[in-house]
């Protein structure tokens, strides 16, 4: 008995598409072995039509594909533009065609449903609008017009020109009689339901001279598009519902059991807690289309998603919809990276961001997710030397360690830095990842003076105290600029006396600026790293002033000025326009993506992502 399973019979009609899913035990060998779809010949052989190794028979060219979903133990054969010639016996299987790891499938393609003569066929998607046109002759111009639906053997009145409307159609049907020149009336039904499908009869007049026209209404429920994305990666659902619903509330929901479709996000401001920090609903175009981006994909995100339009912002009967079946591949190419990073007020965090290593030359970005309205992600820094003004001196994006990971360092942390941040590039859009920064109780580990003033032409020495826990780390000083932080020479001055209960392994490392010039003014960071992996940093602003009295300045912790007040966000800021988040190529060339006006917000409350993958910041 073969362990492969699938549909034994598939029945369809000419011109249609079929999507045949074959199930196999998801062992390691099975997941990676060849998958095939072959047609059984009269003499017992089976001729391959398509396989997972890229082969496509000329009979299937341009109309079929085979997709393997190893995590689920399934593969799917899609065949479009069916003809009666496609009827026959097939096998879906694994390995070699003749080896028996297969399942027999009978495909029968018929000519299509038999219809009454002179029947007009209307094929319309669920939730959309249909207009059934009913011609009549002059003698019936003044007579009653009506539309009936055939229910079993009996015609049931749906609507007529005297004002009757069948209760099943209330609020979504109208009968239009064209001007006197046209001998035609129309019945318009919107918010189509599956139950609306069937045979209709329109009639002008009620006697033996009445004009009749048959109509066959087929209401199509969208077959889910199969979407297969990597764990920890990103997915974008593009939803095009048509201009007729351009002004209706849009939603994305995820089907749970039965009819329930739990709203994930909608344009009325609702967002499911599980997607906090990792979802954007991109604003709709004039044609009513929109898209939803979800990052940091989890195993439990897999399932069936519907997008639609309804004034309630949720799925209702008659909502026009699109459907997707999302599979989340746990054998992900996207490496694990902490989803939560913790830092203390005044301290720092170093965030590792994965990217597709094949795209090392891509532009790297870091943005701050904001939940207001439908969510957006204003850009904070990029790898081309742009830093948002209010983050100058405390934010840097470094290409290190490279080979598929870049680093973002943020220091001088305050409670307002708590929130969700996205790592992304202008390359592979599937590699968007999310990290939550949490501000916890504690003191920064590195101790530096607050603001420091240097005197032109003199020497300045700035201390940085490293506790013993960093004894094995490389210690450095660097000067911050918007392209990174350029390393500077520094001196180890021996053990630090700034820490209680810290032995000889603590260190005082000083930065010395000789013959200070105006160019020395700016932000300086001291920090620790191990190889290309960065740890904590502390920032000092050095101001330069004219000489008042001779001598050199040696700054101690006690003499240092108070830490500068935190800069308040100003109103002009760069934001990834939602289109650009969807496809960062849109802003690869132009730095000023959008100059939206925004007010400084208050402290951002953060929502725990429930992840165990946490990375400590300044306090461990």
């Amino acid at each position: 008995k073969s362990p492969i399973f699938g549909p034994e019979e598939v029945n369809s009609v000419e011109g249609n598409s079929v999507s045949i899913t074959c199930y196999y035990p998801p062992t390691s060998v099975n997941r990676h072995t060849r998958k095939y779809w072959c047609r059984q010949g009269a003499r017992g052989g089976c001729i391959t039509l398509i396989s997972s190794e890229g082969y496509v028979s000329s009979k299937y060219a341009g109309r079929a594909n085979l997709t393997n979903f190893p995590e689920n133990g399934t593969f799917v054969v899609n065949i479009a533009q069916l003809s009666q010639d496609d009827s026959g016996r097939y096998k879906c299987g694994l390995g070699i065609n003749s080896r028996g790891l297969s399942f027999d499938v009978s495909l029968e393609v018929s000519q299509g449903p038999g219809l009454l003569n002179d029947t007009k066929v209307y094929t319309v998607d669920l939730g959309r609008t249909v207009t059934i046109n009913c011609p009549f002759k002059t003698e019936n111009a003044q007579k009653r017009k009506s539309l009936y639906k055939q229910i079993g053997l009996y015609p049931v009145l749906v609507i007529d020109s005297s004002g009757y409307v069948n209760p099943n159609y209330t609020g979504r049907i109208r009968l239009d009689i064209q001007g006197t020149g046209q001998l035609l009336f129309s019945v318009v039904i919107n918010q189509l339901r599956l139950s609306d499908a069937g045979q209709y009869l329109c009639q002008a007049g009620d006697d033996s001279n009445s004009n009749k026209k048959n109509a066959d209404l087929q209401v199509l429920k969208p077959e889910p598009e199969l979407v297969y994305e990597d764990l920890r990666g990103s997915v974008t659902f593009h939803c095009a519902l048509g201009p007729e619903v351009a002004n209706v509330a849009k939603f994305l929901c995820r089907q749970s059991s039965g009819e329930n479709c739990d709203v994930v996000v909608n344009t009325l401001g609702k967002r499911a807690p599980a997607f906090e920090g990792r979802i954007l609903l991109n604003p709709q175009d004039k044609d009513g289309s929109f898209s939803v981006v979800i990052t940091g994909l989890r195993k439990e995100d897999a399932g069936r998603y519907l997008c639609g339009a309804h004034s309630d912002g949720q799925l209702q009967e008659g909502s026009p919809i699109q459907a997707w079946q999302l599979f989340v591949n746990e054998e992900s190419t996207i490496p694990r990276s902490p989803t939560v990073v913790k830092g203390v007020a005044g301290g720092s965090v170093a965030v590792l961001c994965p990217y597709n290593r094949k795209e090392s030359k891509s532009i790297k970005y870091w943005c701050l997710w904001e939940g207001a309205q439908n969510g957006r992600c204003p850009l904070l820094v990029d790898s081309e030397g742009w830093v948002k003004a209010q983050y100058e001196g405390r934010l840097s994006l470094l290409e290190e360690p490279g080979n598929g990971t870049f680093t973002v360092i943020l220091n001088q942390l305050t409670s307002r830095d708590a929130g969700f941040y996205w790592c992304l590039t202008n390359g592979d859009t599937l590699w968007r990842t999310t990290v939550e920064i949490k501000i916890i109780e504690g003191e920064p580990n590195l101790k530096v003076p607050g603001n420091v003033t240097a005197v032109l032409g003199e020497t300045l020495k700035v201390p940085c105290h490293f506790p013993c826990k960093f004894s094995s780390y490389e210690k450095y000083w660097c000067k911050w600029n918007n392209t990174g932080c350029q390393a500077l020479p520094s001196q180890d001055e021996g053990p630090s006396k700034a820490f209680v209960n810290c032995d000889e392994n603590s260190r005082l490392v000083s930065l010395t600026l000789n013959l200070v010039t105006r160019a020395d003014e700016g932000w300086y960071w001291c920090g620790v790293k191990q190889g290309h992996f960065y740890g904590e940093t502390a920032a000092v602003y050095v101001a330069v002033e004219e000489r008042k009295a001779a001598g050199s300045r040696d700054v101690s912790l006690a003499k240092a000025d108070a830490a500068p007040d935190e800069k308040v966000l100003d109103s002009g800021f760069r934001e990834i326009e939602n289109k650009a988040i969807q496809d960062p190529r849109l802003f690869a060339e132009e730095k000023a993506v959008a100059d939206t006006r925004d007010q400084a917000d208050g402290s951002r409350a953060s929502v725990d992502s429930g992840s165990s993958e946490e990375q400590g910041g300044s306090s461990r």
């Epitope: 549909p7 369809s12 087929q218 059991s257 009819e259």
Partner: nanobody, 126 residues
């Protein structure tokens, strides 16, 4: 809410036939597939057959033990699914349950089905 009502069960001799019906009522949007499962005394509920549809395309799935003997079909207009059972055997004795799902998933998986009928008893005597 969708209600499923099974009928057509009964007591028959081995080799005889029975036709089970499952009528769906209530809000049937957007049902994806309907199927039959069975549960013999002291055994777990098991998959028998499922029919899935999309527009004018339909897919029929069967358990190995019923292949060639049972046929699943549906009447779209009546929202009804049938299970024609031929060449019945004593081991086919069980309560037969109708189930419906809206999810695209393995049709054999019990947990894929959100809606269940009360069941109809089929007894096959030797």
């Amino acid at each position: 809410e969708v209600q499923l009502v099974e009928s057509g069960g009964g007591l028959v001799q081995a080799g005889d036939s029975l036709r089970l019906s499952c009528a769906a009522s209530g809000r049937t949007f957007p049902t994806y597939a309907m199927g039959w499962f069975r549960q013999a005394p002291g055994k777990e509920r098991e998959f028998v057959a499922t029919i899935r549809w999309s527009g004018s395309t339909q897919y029929k799935y069967y358990a190995d033990f019923v292949k060639g003997r049972f046929t699943i079909s549906r009447d779209n207009a009546k929202n009804t699914v049938y299970l024609q059972m031929d060449s019945l055997k004593p081991e086919d004795t069980a309560v037969y349950y109708c189930a419906a799902t809206t999810l695209l998933t393995d049709p054999r998986a019990l947990n894929a089905y959100a809606y269940w009928g009360q069941g109809t008893q089929v007894t096959v005597s030797s």
